[in-house]
Interface confidence: low
């Protein structure tokens, strides 16, 4: 989870589930692996925006202390601010919780830029607008950090939803979702609908606006249109998937598909951008530049350093191409594609200089750690993290930003041969680095 572009990011002892409340009864029969249908209590439970992350309200301790927690599918620790910090309005006060248990162990998590460190413990945790349960989970109490918390983001901690393999300090620290599933009847599945506004939000607008939904334990049909298409989770560490083809406005990038997944491809709600391996990024930008050549943009724009502005309401969406990523399907030699619009990969920013223009940053950037399908991709889709069946589902989000001419799409099936060859096998050295 990288800082700046990657939101700063990089878990429950199987203790007795004190205060356990069973899930609410529903009028539908549960359907494995997760309940499907209406999850009214969880819809609209996220706030935030792609540049600073999406967060859910959680409570920790007894009596409950309410905190806003960043939802991060690119890490596996539940970590919360536990000491005063200039960017935090509130923090977890362990001494006020009668159910806190100290694990007498520290944790240190460095990033390329910045870090956090803290003390491990367990406590009772619940999600007010989530399943009606309380679980005892591992918590990293952050006592010191650098370039981790974001001024004005309104979140005080991070919920790492990936697998134990990438938990810090090691894979013995059970992640929150594992604890939740073990201690309750919540099915081993969650789904995310991240809703980009399509325009910059100021602080009060973010607080007042809806940012999306995290449905824990199921799938809500009201959050997507069309069909859900599933891609296998290649390996349970990050949410790793395999991209088999990339097109810009329908034109194949024609690269060896291994390049698309070098050294991995992950789905990460804690990263802002679509991040692509160097070679892929260069080819993609060349193709996007060619497609949008009716207007000339400064080099700094393509590097994500400089914004471009148009008079309010005049953004020429039509000159920018759509981008399609083909993902390995569940059936042999079958793939499907997800297609995003410039409304997803041009990120609206509040221009420091004027409110008269609509200004954007190019939200595709270069990566040295593989492809990262961050918030700009996820904002186009309803994404189902079906851990029980080791697969990730994509459908067109009911809240994605589009225009009257084009819409995001999830389409298939397509015949694609030798897709297994598209996966990159990382040499077996120490993979537990967060220095990405």
């Amino acid at each position: 989870t990288q800082h700046g572009i990657r939101l700063p990011l990089r878990s429950g002892l199987g203790g007795a589930p004190l205060g356990l409340r069973l899930p609410r009864e529903t009028d539908e029969e549960p359907e494995e692996p997760g309940r499907r249908g209406s999850f009214v209590e969880m819809v609209d439970n996220l706030r935030g925006k792609s540049g600073q992350g999406y967060y859910v309200e959680m409570t920790v301790g007894s009596p409950p202390q309410t905190l806003n927690i960043l939802v991060d599918t690119g890490s596996s620790n539940f970590a919360v601010g536990a000491a005063p910090h200039p960017f935090l309005h509130r923090y977890y006060q362990r001494q006020l919780s009668s159910t806190y248990r100290d694990l007498r162990k520290g944790v240190y998590v460095p990033y390329t830029q910045g870090k956090w460190e803290g003390e491990l413990g367990t406590d009772l945790v619940s999600i007010p607008h989530g399943p009606n349960v309380t679980v005892r989970a591992n918590i990293a109490a952050i006592t010191e950090s650098d370039k981790f918390f974001i001024n004005g983001s309104n979140w005080e901690g991070i919920l790492g939803l990936a697998y134990a393999e990438i938990a810090r300090p090691d894979d013995s620290l059970e992640p929150f979702f594992d604890s939740l599933v073990k201690q309750t009847h919540v099915p081993n599945l969650f789904s995310l609908q991240l809703c980009g506004a399509g325009f910059p939000l100021n602080q009060s607008e973010v607080l007042a606006s809806v940012g999306g939904s995290m449905i824990i334990g199921g799938i809500d049909h009201s959050l997507y249109t069309g069909s859900l298409w599933y891609t296998p989770i290649r390996r349970e560490w990050y949410y790793e998937v395999i991209i088999v083809r990339v097109e810009i406005n329908g034109q194949d990038l024609k690269m060896d598909c291994k390049e698309y997944n070098y050294d991995k491809s992950i789905v990460d709600s804690g990263t802002t951008n679509l991040r692509l391996p160097k070679k892929v990024f260069e080819a993609a930008v060349k193709s996007i530049k060619a497609a949008s050549s009716t207007e000339k943009f400064p080099d700094g724009f393509w590097l994500g350093e400089q914004l471009v502005c148009w008079q309010a309401g005049t953004t020429p969406w039509n000159i920018f191409p759509v981008i399609s990523l083909y993902l390995m399907g569940e059936v042999t030699n079958q793939s499907f594609r997800i297609t995003i619009l410039p409304q997803q990969y041009l990120r609206p920013v509040e221009d420091v200089a004027t409110s008269q223009d609509d200004c954007y940053k190019f939200a595709i950037s270069q990566s040295s750690t593989g492809t990262v399908m961050g918030a700009v991709i996820m904002e186009g889709f309803y994404v189902v993290f079906d851990r029980a069946r080791k697969r990730i589902g994509f459908a067109v989000s009911a809240c994605h930003v589009h225009d009257e001419f084009r819409t995001a799409a999830v389409e298939g099936p397509f015949v694609t041969l030798d897709m297994e060859d598209c996966g990159y096998n990382i040499p077996q050295t120490d993979e537990s680095t967060l220095m990405t």
Epitope: P298, L307, V308, D351, A353, T354, Q356
Partner: nanobody
Amino acid sequence: DVQLQESGGGSVQAGGSLRLSCAASGYSYSYYIGWFRQAPGKEREGVAAIAIVNSGGGRTYYADSVKGRFTISQGNDKNTVYLQMNSLKPEDTAIYYCAARSLSWYSHPLLQPSQFNNWGQGTQVTVSS
């Protein structure tokens, strides 16, 4: 390439006024124009800046020493920026430079010379008492 050309400098009595112009060419997208000055034996310092955006003049920024006396504005053609200097003082005597930089998201502090990468040749302003 971006080119900047200042004009309008000259000599004036204390309390008088001058209007400097900066003609910019070569920018196709949003950018900042700043006015800086350098008095003999002193470091170059920021005076005022304005964001030039597609729809017209954006936010303006002023050094404390000139607030209320100087006004920066954009001309109708979008390629000219004016610095209207009123209530001039002898300490305003300096060579005045026009400078430009891309308008990027990480924009502060705006009135530091190091933030600007395109510079004009300068125009002399002399204020006598």
